[in-house]
């Protein structure tokens, strides 16, 4: 009798369970970017450290060639911060010269690439006008949200201007994802 | 026969499982900071509310003396927002006086302290130049990412200038972590 | 003997377990806002896309009339980003005209409404002074944190000025929550 009571609830509750510790996860950190050919009208992608310091990939979440590879379908939390730094922005130089105020901007995009789909999908975008009057400016853009991803999807981080990315510290610029 | 088929898969799948509801979690909220001796060349740490209002700690995640104590090893999502506020920044005053533009800045760092390791580790940093021209400025810095932490690790939030932290509302300045 | 050893640990470990895949989750994305009557002294709430594109609700997490409905009690991670955009802010216009510097501001609030409680609770606030000197400015405010929510709670996103919200892209302005 005990066995009969137990069996159905066991089957009902535990079938799709899995240990949290074996879920795909990655936290990637910034490195100095190497010069690459950027496609016209397309923001360049950052490449990342995946092993040293705070960086890691685990449980079949792999990093290769600027992409995080999604090893199994499910809902993932995906995040990135990019810290930008520059000199006085064009906007204030132009303003001082009495010409129209065209603000510079900085943009971060987390992009999903699906091989079976021709166009990349922009999952997250953080974009900010920069019209600083100090001689040096620096600021982060942070992004994070949950997405339903498919096995084989690839994630990358694109930025509007790779030359402005602060690559000096692993805690300033980073990229990560984990299966919920 | 059925029993024989069942046993191995049971052992294989369920061994490391644990209930989500008993995972270590904390959300801490801002309080007015009390005067403490600040170490030169080291950003001061904030202290926090851990019980009242929206704040809580649970499942052996404890808060003591500005630190969140990590009660078990694993991958944690760690986050904080600090809202800063001030009056016209020095940068714009200097600019008006025709002297070189030295921007002020605001910085938040989430730091890990491991007793067995002499130097704290900076997990996350958000840093921003402030060169505001209005009479009052205010802005948040948000940080969040996943880290592999060890039992006994301690987390704190350090800021570049404790005197500019907005302590007025629990939803403006906060700090949290949860085991994934 | 084997059975006797097995039973207690089974009862001890697995009782409150549940499959990750059936947890309430939602990611909502921006749509053009329809004009509504705003209550005086109360920030207007945004309404959202919940099905098309990147947006989804699942596992009894429902969206209705600007609210995310919490279907079961537990700890949730709640997040939102709102991208604002505008012309030169009032602050810089006033400054140019030689009047006192009153900066504009932009604010995002994630609010919890509990039917049994008369006053809404502000869970998260991101507020930023805007004193831009370029002719066009745009910037995001990101928020995210963990909260203990009760079945029946409702979440919404309020903004200081609905007319400044960038509704042009689903990746720029979004709102989500998931049970941990």
């Amino acid at each position: 009798l005990k066995g009969q009571e137990f069996a159905p609830s066991h089957q009902q509750v535990y079938a799709p369970l899995r240990a949290d510790g074996d879920k795909p996860r990655a936290h990637l950190t910034v490195v100095r970017q190497t010069p690459t050919q950027h496609l016209k009208n397309q923001f360049p992608a950052l490449h990342w450290e995946h092993e040293l310091g705070l960086a890691f990939t685990k449980n079949r979440m792999n990093y290769t060639n600027k992409f995080l590879l999604i090893p199994e379908s499910g809902d993932y939390f995906v995040y990135s911060q990019v810290t930008f730094r520059g000199m006085t922005s064009e906007c204030s130089e132009i303003r001082q010269a009495g010409r129209p105020n065209k603000p510079d901007s900085i943009t971060v995009v987390i992009t999903k690439v699906t091989d079976s789909y021709p166009e990349p999908t922009q999952l997250l975008m953080g974009t900010k006008s920069v019209c600083e009057v100090g001689s040096n400016w620096f600021q982060p853009i942070y992004l994070g949200a949950m997405f339903s991803l498919q096995e084989g999807d690839k994630l990358m981080v694109n930025v509007s201007d790779i030359s402005l990315v602060d690559y000096t510290k692993e805690d300033k610029t980073f990229f990560g994802a984990f299966l919920l | 026969l059925k029993g024989q088929e069942f046993a191995p898969s049971h052992q294989q799948v369920y061994a490391p499982l644990r209930a989500d509801g008993d995972k270590p979690r904390a959300h801490l909220t801002v309080v007015r900071q009390t005067p403490t001796q600040h170490l030169k060349n080291q950003f001061p740490a904030l202290h926090w509310e851990h019980e009242l209002g929206l704040a809580f700690t649970k499942n052996r995640m404890n808060y003591t003396n500005k630190f969140l104590l990590i009660p078990e090893s694993g991958d944690y999502f760690v986050y904080s927002q600090v809202t800063f506020r001030g009056m016209t920044s020095e940068c714009s005053e200097i600019r008006q006086a025709g002297r070189p533009n030295k921007p002020d800045s605001i910085t938040v760092v989430i730091t890990k302290v491991t007793d067995s390791y002499p130097e704290p580790t900076q997990l996350l940093m958000g840093t921003k130049s402030v060169c505001e021209v209005g009479s009052n400025w205010f802005q948040p810095i948000y940080l969040g990412a996943m880290f592999s932490l060890q039992e006994g690790d301690k987390l704190m939030v350090n800021v570049s200038d404790i005197s500019l932290v907005d302590y007025t509302k629990e939803d403006k300045t906060f700090f949290g972590a949860f085991l994934l | 003997l084997k059975g006797q050893e097995f039973a207690p640990s089974h009862q001890q470990v697995y009782a409150p377990l549940r499959a990750d895949g059936d947890k309430p989750r939602a990611h909502l994305t921006v749509v053009r806002q329809t004009p509504t009557q705003h209550l005086k002294n109360q920030f207007p709430a945004l309404h959202w896309e919940h099905e098309l594109g990147l947006a989804f609700t699942k596992n009894r997490m429902n969206y209705t009339n600007k609210f995310l409905l919490i279907p079961e009690s537990g700890d949730y991670f709640v997040y939102s980003q709102v991208t604002f955009r505008g012309m030169t802010s009032e602050c810089s216009e006033i400054r140019q005209a030689g009047r006192p510097n009153k900066p504009d501001s932009i604010t995002v609030v994630i609010t919890k409404v509990t039917d049994s409680y008369p006053e809404p609770t502000q869970l998260l606030m991101g507020t930023k002074s805007v004193c831009e000197v370029g002719s066009n400015w745009f910037q995001p405010i990101y928020l995210g944190a963990m909260f203990s929510l009760q079945e029946g709670d409702k979440l919404m996103v309020n903004v200081s000025d609905i007319s400044l919200v960038d509704y042009t892209k689903e990746d720029k302005t979004f709102f989500g929550a998931f049970l941990l």
């Epitope: - | 007015r32 009479s135 200038d161 404790i162 500019l164 932290v165 007025t168 | -």
Partner: antibody, heavy 120, light 107 residues
């Protein structure tokens, strides 16, 4: 016990300068923001300036911006207010007051005040 | 700047009276308000902070209440030592600003 003692007040002609001092004792001076607040004869209280505990942030009322400079010497437990280009409307009793850690907060201790009279 | 308006500007009362002073802010300041007492020729003294918290050493006959834009200082039973001028001050946003004062005098 906490003590704040102002000095340096006096009579000065318009356009001239004056430097006020505030000697602090009975607390850890270097841990608190410090303020100057003034009160014109027969009038109410007006906040003048604040300096953060470490001296890194200094904010001023619009009425004195560009003319007054607040500073502190934590090794001497002393707060200063350098007042330049003085005007008749700067005539007041000047109080130094202790704030909290945040530079925007209440004032829990006040000095006895020092009178500054700007007159030709 | 946030304007703080106190009323009345002068109040005549007798020892033992219950006295209420009102302070209004031109915009919401949550609970970030302090009350001070000042006697002629003396420095102000902190009575109440955070709208309702009694400063250490201040008699319990003083109490503060309110939030948002409307605040009150109440003296439950006026004592001879309480005849003075009272000021409210907001510290919700820069710059900190004071009310014009309320003088409590002997009737």
């Amino acid at each position: 016990q906490v003590q704040l003692v102002e000095s340096g007040g006096g009579v000065v002609q318009p356009g001239r300068s004056l430097r006020l001092s505030c000697a602090a004792s009975g607390f850890t001076f270097s841990s608190y923001a410090m303020h100057w607040v003034r009160q014109a004869p027969g009038k109410g209280l007006e906040w003048v300036a604040v300096i953060s505990y470490d001296g890194s942030n200094k904010y001023y009322a619009d009425s004195v911006k560009g003319r007054f400079t607040i500073s502190r010497d934590n090794s001497k437990n002393t707060l200063y207010l350098q007042m330049n280009s003085l005007r008749a409307e700067d005539t007041a009793v000047y109080y130094c007051a202790r704030g909290q850690v945040a530079i925007l907060d209440y004032f829990d201790y006040w000095g006895q005040g020092t009178l500054v009279t700007v007159s030709s | 700047d946030i304007q703080m308006t106190q009323s009345p500007s002068t109040l005549s009362a007798s020892v033992g009276d219950r006295v209420t002073i009102t302070c209004r802010a031109s915009q919401s300041i949550s609970s970030w308000l302090a009350w001070y007492q000042q006697k002629p020729g003396k420095a102000p003294k902190l009575l109440i902070y955070d709208a309702s918290s009694l400063e250490s050493g201040v008699p319990s006959r003083f109490s503060g209440s309110g939030s948002g834009t409307e605040f009150t200082l109440t003296i439950s039973s006026l004592q001879p030592d309480d005849f003075a001028t009272y000021y409210c001050q907001q510290y919700n946003s820069y710059p900190p600003t004071f009310g014009g004062g309320t003088k409590v005098e002997i009737k």
